[in-house]
Interface confidence: low
């Protein structure tokens, strides 16, 4: 907490400029008007303030806006954003995607911090749903963002937003998250032709039910083993040997290498040995 002291004669700041880096903390507190700071926030990032000086500037804004900063200030916080606590951010009402992008840029290259997570949460809640533009932005900064959401939160993602999802965005999703995302993807891509559809839906198939896998097996999709191994065990179990053979196409030979792993192991155990023998892979049920 900086002591309240009078501003020395001639030191009253008329604008936010580089001369302020020579001010001691108490001088910044006494000589910089909070309202001036708020209107010239865009200049702060161009000035090499120390962390201690930034603390003073934050303190001044906190005093000016005890109920939370207005978006006009938030958009220009820049590196001062790194000084904010999740509690500070919970007071904000961020509605502009440009503001979100500006603050995410400050944290770029780093893990998602509690501050960023709170900011995103406030933004998405303010919008009411995770629209395509927001999802595009968030996954660009944080490829794992989608998989950081709970299944309940994912349920608010509209199918139209699924077009923004890239395969790498789903890398860390757990099975229950894919259970929620898959039906949305199926709806989003429903008007695509067979081969294009499979390319798009492939990343989401960890949430696919048996009947959809059976349908895919009739379309010569040649699913790779990596995708097959991510399928739900309970969805794979009812598939016949012929259906798995059609689903995998030339990749069916890879079953041998995966015979001790789920879901292949569980599937093999439920097949008749004479059916397995038709594959010529030496699989033992």
């Amino acid at each position: 907490e900086v002591e309240k002291t009078a501003c020395p004669s001639g030191k009253k700041a008329r604008e936010i400029d580089e001369s302020l880096i020579f001010y001691k903390k108490w001088e910044l507190e006494a000589c910089v008007d909070a309202a001036l700071l708020a209107t010239q926030m865009d200049r702060v990032n161009a000035i090499p303030f120390t962390y201690e000086q930034l603390d003073v500037l934050k303190h001044k804004l906190d005093e000016l806006y005890p109920q939370g900063y207005p978006e006009s200030v938030i958009q220009h916080l820049g590196y001062l954003f790194l000084k904010m606590s999740p509690e500070d951010i919970r007071k904000w009402n961020v509605t502009s995607l440009e503001t979100l992008k500006a603050l995410l840029e400050v944290n770029k290259g780093h893990e998602m911090s509690p501050q960023v997570a709170t900011l995103i949460d406030r933004f998405v809640k303010g919008r009411g749903q995770l629209d395509k533009d927001t999802l595009d932005t968030l996954t660009a900064f944080y490829p794992g963002y989608l998989c950081s959401l709970s299944p309940e939160e994912l349920s608010s993602v509209p199918p139209s937003s699924i077009w923004a999802v890239r395969p790498q965005d789903l890398d860390t999703c757990d099975p229950r998250q894919l259970d929620v995302l898959y039906p949305k993807a199926r709806l989003a891509f429903q008007n695509m032709n067979g081969s294009e559809y499979f390319v798009k839906i492939q990343s989401f198939l960890g949430g696919a039910p048996t009947e959809d896998l059976k349908a895919l097996s009739q379309q010569n999709v040649s699913m790779d083993l990596a995708t097959f191994m991510k399928l739900r065990t309970d969805a794979v179990l009812p598939l016949t040997v012929a259906e798995v053979q059609k689903l995998l196409g030339p990749h069916v030979e890879g079953l041998k290498a995966e015979e001790r792993h789920r879901p292949v192991r569980d599937w093999i155990l439920r097949q008749r040995q004479d059916d397995l023998d038709t594959l010529g892979l030496g699989l033992q049920g």
Epitope: C147, S150, E152, T172, D174, R176, K230, R232, D234
Partner: antibody, heavy 119, light 107 residues
């Protein structure tokens, strides 16, 4: 085969934080197929799911406990952990760690550890 | 949250009896229903997953059936080691929830 072992203090004071660790042996906490859960059972009562974590660090908590729970994973030690803050006597229970397989069932459980909240 | 209601809460039976325990979900959970057996001082043990699939190593006298909201666990011929408490659990959506349990006692 995969085995789970809980460890941590058996006595925690009210308002403090309960911390437990589950060590996975004979398998990997980094398995893409599995979710790692904490479940508790107060004396003489039924089972309550606390939350789970995926190898990637993605978590899902029971809303009734969400504000007090943190589950984390340490893939280098093949462990996952539970922290429950601001405990009261109502948090006295046997705490189990369990593996939820791809079939959606808890197929492997630790033996459980009794945690008593008392001053 | 999905509520799981088990009935009866307890029952008395003799060795060799056929025992049926029911579990009802407050909304449809497809086939995402598991059954566990718990003995005093021990961790629960998985018996049935996905409503009707028998877990490896579990005796075939245990069977499960049902889909949607109504499920049944059947023990075709009760054995001395089967006296325990049985729990159902849904894995359809989070929070994952358990039934209140059914205690099977010796008559």
């Amino acid at each position: 085969q995969v085995q789970l072992q809980e460890s941590g203090p058996g006595l925690v004071k009210p308002s403090e934080t309960l911390s437990l660790t589950c060590t996975v042996s004979g398998g990997s906490v980094s398995s893409r197929d599995d979710l790692w859960s904490w479940i508790r059972q107060p004396p003489g009562k039924g089972l309550e799911w606390i939350g789970y974590i995926y190898y990637s660090g993605s978590t899902n908590y029971n809303p009734s406990l969400k504000s007090r729970v943190t589950i984390s994973v340490d893939t280098s030690k093949n462990q996952f952990s539970l922290k429950l803050s601001s405990v009261t006597a109502a948090d006295t229970a046997v705490y189990y760690c369990a593996r939820e397989g791809k079939n959606g069932a808890f197929d492997i459980w630790g033996q459980g550890t009794m945690v008593t909240v008392s001053s | 949250d999905i509520q799981m209601t088990q009935s009866p809460s307890s029952l008395s039976a003799s060795v060799g009896d056929r025992v049926t325990i029911t579990c009802r979900a407050s909304q449809s959970i497809s086939s995402y229903l598991n059954w566990y057996q718990q003995k005093p001082g021990k961790a629960p043990k998985l018996l049935i997953y996905a409503a009707s699939s028998l877990q490896s190593g579990v005796p075939s006298r245990f069977s499960g059936s049902g889909s949607g909201t109504d499920f049944t666990l059947t023990i075709s011929s009760l054995q001395p080691e089967d006296f325990a408490t049985y729990y159902c659990q849904q894995s359809y959506s989070t929070p994952l929830t358990f039934g209140g349990g059914t205690k099977v006692e010796i008559k």
